[in-house]
């Protein structure tokens, strides 16, 4: 009886794993084996596919074959018993185009109100992604184990920290990789769960802000308790994208080690031009807080995006505010060569109720004020460019009294 050649051959490639699956053409014939040949582009001869010779099942693995993953390859299969079937040729394919990204490896660390996620490609030193290793981005789905309500987080890198979680709560997540340059979306990792710790005695510092004063950077933060010492560390932001060995060498800012105030001042020349991450930790001598949320700090923008300088002309029911260029040391105005938008906050001196005006113009009217009342004003600048979504710190507050009634003309 003539053997029929196998049909419906499927090639599955996940990372560096090359798997072939096919259907038997004749289930009634026993003890049949299957063999594959392959042919590279531009070659006439067929070569035996190692790992896929005399296979008794309908699946084989040819991962050991060292292929150029960008080169087209053709496969053929036949059935063998006493005689052989005719060859069945599989449509030619390029391994890289066909390949799927496998599930990444995930490692979790828990704090009281945060989880640190370390992600690395599922296949170490992958041949398939050798040229794309630095281009991986990841996305994840996270949920509270008790509720199942999912939150998606896109475009993260090999280390990501999720804040504002609840203590002593189990969170579960799964992660997948993507190579946006090749339009490839990977397979989700298995689900990983971790429980956040009991609430720490000391909370982390909050609301970290960097401003420029003269030739110095001023770093300020808020803290709940007094009589604490703080330390500040920095890291090159690009290292977060680097899927290297997951050792992030945060460095101390010398002038911000063991400071006893909620601010520290250090020279601008501590940092070369670049983008950095900053974090702050508090300690009372016995206990140490977890690190604060990391803030991004761009020296280029920080150096130029200074708080606006303004003058106020007071009327009985309004203020006219004239915004000028900020001053550098030596009283020289800074040239801001990108469009800015101004946020003006004002409040009655005796009240905490703040009102806000957002304005592109440099002359702004603050309306509906009461006569003979002291109002305070502060302002900050924002870049209008979406890619450089940066803000200056607020200027110092300026307080003025409105004029008596009927002076609005």
């Amino acid at each position: 009886k003539n053997l029929k050649s196998p049909q419906k051959v499927e090639v599955d490639i996940i990372d560096d794993n090359f798997i072939l699956r096919w259907n038997r053409s004749d289930e009634s014939v026993g003890n049949v084996t299957f063999s594959f040949d392959y042919q590279k582009t531009g070659m006439d001869n067929w070569i035996k596919l190692s790992g896929c010779q005399n296979i008794t099942s309908t699946k084989c693995n040819f991962s050991s074959l060292k292929l150029n993953v960008y080169e087209e390859i053709k496969l053929r299969i036949r059935a063998e018993k006493e005689n052989t079937s005719s060859w069945y040729e599989v449509d030619s394919f390029t391994p890289f185009r066909k390949a799927q990204i496998g599930p990444p490896e995930v490692h979790l660390e828990a704090e009281d109100k945060a989880i640190v996620i370390h992600i690395s490609p599922g296949t170490k030193d992958s041949v398939m992604w050798a040229l794309d290793g630095l281009s991986f981005t990841y996305s994840l789905v996270i949920w509270k184990n008790s509720s199942g309500v999912e939150e998606r987080i896109e475009n993260i890198y090999s280390r990501h920290k999720i804040y504002k979680l609840s203590p002593e709560t189990t969170y579960c997540l799964k992660v997948k990789a993507a190579l946006l340059t090749s339009w490839k979306i990977g397979v989700y990792s298995p689900v990983h769960c971790i429980k956040t710790t009991v609430e720490n005695e000391l909370p982390p510092p909050e609301n970290i802000e960097v401003s420029v004063q003269n030739q110095n950077y001023v770093l300020k933060w808020d803290y709940t308790y007094a009589n604490m010492t703080f330390q500040v560390q920095w890291l090159h932001a690009f290292l977060k994208r680097n899927p290297g060995n997951h050792l992030y060498k945060w460095k101390q800012i010398p002038d911000c080690e063991n400071v006893k105030t909620t601010q520290c001042v250090f020279p601008q020349n501590v940092f070369q031009k670049g983008i950095y991450l900053l974090r702050v930790q508090a300690s009372d001598g016995n206990n140490t807080s977890f690190w604060s949320e990391e803030i991004k700090f761009d020296t280029e923008i920080q150096a130029f995006l200074l708080p606006p300088v303004f003058n106020i002309r007071s009327l009985s029911d309004s203020f006219h505010i004239y915004i000028g260029a900020p001053k550098q040391s030596g009283n020289t105005p800074v040239i801001q060569d990108y469009p800015l938008i101004y946020e003006i906050i004002f409040w009655e001196n005796t009240s905490n109720a703040e009102r806000k005006i957002i304005e592109k113009k440099t002359d702004v009217t603050v309306p509906n004020l009461k006569p003979l009342t002291v109002y305070c004003v502060k302002a900050r600048a924002h870049t209008m460019d979406e890619k450089l979504n940066k803000s200056s710190v607020f200027s110092d507050a300026v307080c003025e009294k409105t004029k008596p009634g009927n002076t609005s003309k």
Epitope: H107, L108, E109, A110, E111, D112, V116, H118, I194, T197, V198, N200, E201, G244, N245, H246, L247, Y248, K249, K251, Q252, Q281, N286, N287, T288, F290
Partner: antibody, heavy 118, light 107 residues
Framework: EVQLQQSGAELVKPGASVKLSCTGS????????IHWVKQRTEQGLEWIGR????????KYAPKFQGKATITADTSSNTAYLQLSSLTSEDTVVYYC???????????WGQGTSVTVSS | DIVMTQSQKFMSTSVGDRVSVTCKTS??????VAWYQQKPGQSPKPLIY???YRYSGVPDRFTGSGSGTDFTLIISNVQSEDLAEYFC?????????FGGGTLLEIK
């Protein structure tokens, strides 16, 4: 294969100094931190300090500040621990270890025994 | 400094038993705890990192758990080669510290 090879046993006189070495193979020490740990006979482990061989930045346990000096030479892939003003208290085994972020101390040297005796 | 307390200096167990070695920290260290095994005359051998992750090559009868201030190393189906001292280690904040050790004896 990743390995940390420590220098041989030392016999030194009280008041003298000693410099121990720890050479990495199978990896580049500047990509990691190298830590030093002290262990008295039949006793627990005590953390001495660590170095970032990339830039020489060090951290020490307060009790070893002034007693221990950690240095590194990336060209020979070696970290060093120098101990000064030795006393009988320093007759112990010293270990170096590679620190790898959340993997902690994932590789250790075989240890160097230091005996302080006149 | 963060104090690591391994309250049991010695533990006696039999082959095939399950044993729990505990470690308490003086403050919350998240999950920044590792466990090491040390046999006489040898350097410490890494077992567990980040509280619950096994180093490659470590048998799966070794399991780590806990978080915050309470940590446990569980050895299920104890083998005679598990006779050793076990140390916990915190790497949350400097100075890094170790527990005093728990010596596991096989009956």
């Amino acid at each position: 294969e990743v390995q940390l090879q420590q220098s041989g046993a030392e016999l030194v006189k009280p008041g003298a100094s000693v410099k121990l070495s720890c050479t990495g193979s199978g990896f580049n020490i500047k990509d990691y931190y190298i830590h030093w740990v002290k262990q008295r006979t039949e006793q627990g482990l005590e953390w001495i300090g660590r170095i970032d061989p990339e830039d020489g930045e060090t951290k020490y346990a307060p009790k070893f500040q002034g007693k221990a000096t950690i240095t590194a030479d990336t060209s020979s892939n070696t970290a060093y621990l120098q101990l000064s003003s030795l006393t009988s208290e320093d007759t112990v085994v010293y270990y170096c270890g590679r620190y790898h972020g959340y993997w902690a101390l994932d590789y250790w040297g075989q240890g160097t025994s230091v005996t302080v005796s006149s | 400094d963060i104090v690591m307390t391994q309250s049991q200096k010695f533990m006696s167990t039999s082959v095939g038993d399950r044993v729990s070695v505990t470690c308490k920290t003086s403050q919350n260290v998240g999950t920044n705890v590792a466990w090491y095994q040390q046999k006489p005359g040898q350097s410490p051998k890494p077992l567990i990192y980040s509280t619950s992750y096994r180093y490659s090559g470590v048998p799966d009868r070794f399991t780590g758990s806990g978080s915050g201030t309470d940590f446990t190393l569980i050895i299920s189906n104890v083998q005679s080669e598990d006779l050793a001292e076990y140390f916990c280690h915190q790497y949350f904040s400097y100075p890094y510290t170790f527990g005093g050790g728990t010596l596991l004896e096989i009956k």
